[in-house]
Interface confidence: low
């Protein structure tokens, strides 16, 4: 079941998945001046069995001006490229993604790939948030969001992360309430059905990650 919406946006924060649940799709997008080859896949799909998951299909881009296809990097589940920015606010252990059954790693780049990756997440997917460079986490609760099924519809849980500029003074001494309390949202969020998630990956986020932002182009 695909998630209807994108994960919530948090001011001055980015999110990424540490691993992608089977069923996740990644659009084959090409950068300006390039396009998918005519017979090329529209998307990559995370598929697998009980012991191994990998990305099906491969994305290929060709110059809009020529008919020659560019070299293609075939996604390998062993490879991993993290796209995230800034240091974590608190040290945590990195996730061994090979130990997460039913999940695919971050696909490696393909030549002339677009600057932004567009994923289509499935129910049960978890994404993690951290503040962008120049901002720090204030009074952080769960800096993650999970796509859950509720009354036949999907929703993302609200990440309880507030990012403030380094020079700003904290308005959260002690246990004061965060601005627009992320938990006191007006919409109804009572669930009829949820899928359980892997708690291990909820709490074991990488302590250091490469400083290329989640949606930023590859060098």
């Amino acid at each position: 079941e695909l998630c209807d919406d994108d994960p919530p946006e948090i001011p001055h924060a980015t999110f990424k998945a540490m691993a992608y649940k089977e069923g996740t799709m990644l659009n084959c997008e090409c950068k300006r001046g390039f396009r998918r080859i005519k017979s090329g896949s529209l998307y990559m799909l995370c598929t697998g069995n009980s012991s191994h998951s990998s990305w099906d299909n491969q994305c290929q881009c060709t110059s809009s001006a020529t008919r020659n296809t560019t070299k293609q990097v075939t996604p390998q589940p062993e490879e991993q490229k993290e796209r995230k920015t800034t240091e974590m606010q608190s040290p945590m252990q990195p996730v061994d993604q090979a130990s997460l059954p039913g999940h695919c790693r971050e696909p490696p780049p393909w030549e002339n790939e677009a600057t932004e990756r567009i994923y289509h997440f499935v129910v049960g997917q978890m994404v993690y948030y951290q503040c962008v460079q120049g901002y720090r986490a204030l009074h952080r609760g769960p800096a993650e969001s999970v796509c859950k099924m509720t009354h036949g519809k999907t929703r993302w849980t609200q990440p309880q992360l507030i990012c403030t500029g380094e020079m700003e003074t904290s308005q959260f001494p002690g246990e004061e309430k965060p601005q627009a309390s992320p938990e006191g949202r007006p919409e109804s969020e009572t669930s009829c059905l949820v899928t359980t998630t892997d708690f291990q990956i909820q709490t074991e986020m990488a302590a250091t990650m490469e400083t290329s932002i989640f949606t930023t182009e590859y060098q």
């Epitope: 009074h139 952080r140 609760g141 769960p142 800096a143 993650e144 999970v146 859950k148 849980t157 609200q158 309880q160 246990e175 004061e176 309430k177 965060p178 309390s181 992320p182 938990e183 006191g184 949202r185 007006p186 919409e187 109804s188 969020e189 009572t190 669930s191 009829c192 059905l193 949820v194 359980t196 998630t197 708690f199 909820q202 709490t203």
Partner: nanobody, 127 residues
Framework: EVQLVESGGGLVQAGGSLRLSCAAS????????MGWFRRAPGKEREFVAA????????LYAGSVKGRFTISRDNGRNMVYLQMNSLKPEDTAVYYC????????????????????WGQGTQVTVSS
Amino acid sequence: EVQLVESGGGLVQAGGSLRLSCAASGGTFRTRNMGWFRRAPGKEREFVAAVSWNVDNKLYAGSVKGRFTISRDNGRNMVYLQMNSLKPEDTAVYYCAADNIPLSSDMRPTATEYDYWGQGTQVTVSS
């Protein structure tokens, strides 16, 4: 693996008090929203109370409001349910639950929203 262990249940007379405790381990406790549910004999599991990760939001079922108080101690990885003025209809198995769902002030969570559960502790209120 998250583990929740309840304690503090027992037999008490109507009008008495009990304090239930829930010890959490195996995960980052301070980032969880915690709740108490109960199941009376022959009935569905029902929501009792919940507390948000930073204790800025507490919710109670109408039947326990004013009598029960939920609290948590992030330093000790504990959640508590103080139950006063107990009634025979409070007799049930009480379960501690955890998840990172947001708490909405106008809706009570249902049991299916919580992914992590304890084994429960029996509370019996005699008349």
